[in-house]
């Protein structure tokens, strides 16, 4: 990636790591508004299974790993980069090493959730406070859960499918930060690890993922009123450890692996109509990426 | 019945490639890690390669990293591996096998027997 | 890398001797651990996996236990069919590593 500023514009969706061979260390950022890629400073350490999350205006790429020939290290690292200086730094680490973990944000306060050390699948969650740079262990949730989506919905963390070291997941489950606690929500219709889960006008979506058998292109969103779980139109491409967020209204999808190929494409949802569309392509395909949206 | 079939292996020369097939059947290759072992002879079982099948990741042994590479056609239930740059230390019998409990593997093949020597 | 240190190499045995082969991780494994049986001109055999847990179709004179980092196989009352070499295996952290396997043969 090039060092030189990145241009102040307004929201883009940044792209961070991913895998291709191995661990890739590329940080890109795709403008919706004028279809262009912008190229960033890289990762300091390439990764992949890694999330990403946007808190005051600072983007984090959260745990992964480096897949590389020399080696394979899950990371327990957090990176803040600053889109104003296009540079990373190393913030406090994880208590745990955490590949294909979930992030979420509540009060701008991050979450990590499960993911895997080795052969061991967390159940365990933290929380980063970025003011004082710590993390501290919060309630574990009530399943083990590897390449699990989560999302924050009226400040509720949800915890969506994944993988507890046996079986793939179609469970989901909520953590209420007030309590401290997980309870369990009505299961998805579809098992699903490494799909792609995101909130959009109040509903949490799941795309894609992985049913232990194939990748899926099915998409499904739980509404948190009526606390059921309903299909909308299915992705072209089926999909796992994929990367998704939401801009202006609508669901982006990028990259992952559809069981032969590691995707370039990124689809787009727009709940009015029900569609998706291939609105770009990636600059390579890739795996496991951690996406997110910057703040105006 | 589950059954995994590996082909390919021969007599190469140093320097030289192989790609050695594994045929799956009684179960979807989607649907489970595929792991390469090797056993030179007369020694015990080295791991060499994995592939994951959600998210694609592939793994290597440092002995053969850069060198080999695994890969998996579900359409024909088939895992690979390509084997560039032999060497007479790549002199085995290369085993697939499916990856269950953990990577503890719980089904493997009759084995393909490479020769590197010149 | 793990090192997994199998003990004994070889060991002689009788029909109807209880057999033990132990195996030390050079550092934790957890319970990531599986033994199999391979004879020769054969591909191995799982026996047990996750330290102690039985593979289907394994007769249940075979058992695994777990101490720390060490792991054992214990085949109760040794069969004429049981004569072979045993191979533990750590899955917890790559590489993958075997141990160097122990030869079971007839006293």
């Known amino acids: 990636g090039s060092m030189g500023h990145a241009p102040k514009v307004g929201r883009l969706i940044y792209t961070a790591g991913g895998y291709f061979r191995q661990s890739l260390s590329y940080l890109e950022a795709y403008n919706p508004s004028d279809g262009t890629w912008l190229d960033l400073a890289d990762l300091q350490v390439p990764r992949s299974g890694l999330a990403g999350c946007v808190v005051g205006g600072l983007l984090y790429a959260v745990g992964g790993r480096n897949n590389s020939p020399d080696g394979n290290t899950d990371s327990s690292a957090l990176d803040c980069y600053n889109p104003m200086t296009n540079q990373w730094s190393p913030c406090a680490p994880m208590s745990v090493p955490r590949n294909r973990i979930g992030v979420g944000v509540i009060d701008g306060h991050i979450y990590a959730v499960g993911g895997s050390h080795g052969c061991i699948h967390h159940n365990s969650v933290e929380r980063y406070e970025p003011e004082r740079d710590e993390w501290h262990l919060v309630a574990p949730m009530l399943t083990r859960r590897i390449g699990v989506g989560v999302a924050v919905l009226n400040r509720l963390l949800y915890a969506v499918g994944g993988f507890d070291g046996t079986n793939r997941l179609n469970s989901a489950e909520c953590y209420y930060p007030e309590r401290n606690e997980w309870r369990m929500i009505t299961a998805m219709n579809t098992i699903r690890s490494g799909a792609g889960v995101c909130v959009l006008h109040n509903c949490i979506y799941a795309a894609g993922g992985y049913d232990g058998q194939d990748q899926l292109n099915s998409v499904e969103r739980y509404d948190v009123e009526t606390e059921t779980w309903t299909f909308v139109a299915p992705m072209k491409h089926r999909r796992s450890a994929l990367g998704i967020t939401v801009h202006q209204g609508r669901i982006y999808v990028l990259g992952g692996y559809d069981g032969h190929t590691f995707l370039d494409s990124v689809e787009c949802y727009d709940p009015d109509t029900d569609t998706w569309s291939e609105v770009t392509r990636m600059t390579s395909g890739r795996s496991g990426v951690g996406v997110a949206v910057t703040m105006e | 019945e589950v059954q995994l079939v590996e082909s390919g292996g021969g007599l190469v020369q140093p320097g030289g490639s192989l790609r050695l097939s594994c045929a799956a059947s009684g179960f979807a290759i989607s649907a489970s890690s595929i792991h390469w072992v090797r056993q030179a002879p007369g020694k015990g079982l080295e791991w060499v390669a994995s592939i994951d099948p959600e998210t694609g990741e592939t793994l290597y042994a440092k002995s053969v990293a850069g060198r080999f590479t695994i890969s998996a056609d579900t359409s024909k239930n088939t895992a690979y591996l390509q084997m560039n740059s032999l060497r007479a230390e790549d002199t085995a019998v290369y085993y697939c096998?499916?990856?269950?409990?953990?990577?503890?593997?719980?089904?493997w093949g009759q084995g393909t027997l490479v020769t590197v020597s010149s | 890398d793990i090192q997994m240190t199998q003990s004994p190499s070889s060991l002689s045995a009788s029909v109807g001797d209880r057999v033990t082969i132990t195996c030390r991780a050079s550092q934790s494994v957890s319970s990531a651990v599986a033994w199999y049986q391979q004879k020769p001109g054969k591909a191995p055999k799982l026996l047990i996996y996750s330290a102690s847990s039985l593979y289907s179709g394994v007769p249940s004179r075979f058992s695994g236990s777990r101490s720390g980092t060490d792991f054992t196989l214990t085949i109760s009352s040794l069969q004429p069919e049981d004569f072979a070499t045993y191979y533990c295996?750590?899955?917890?952290?790559?590489?993958?590593?075997f141990g160097q396997g122990t030869k079971v043969e007839i006293k």
């Open positions: 295996q750590q899955s917890y952290s790559f590489p993958s590593t």
């Open positions: 096998s499916r990856g269950q409990y953990g990577d503890a593997t719980d089904y």
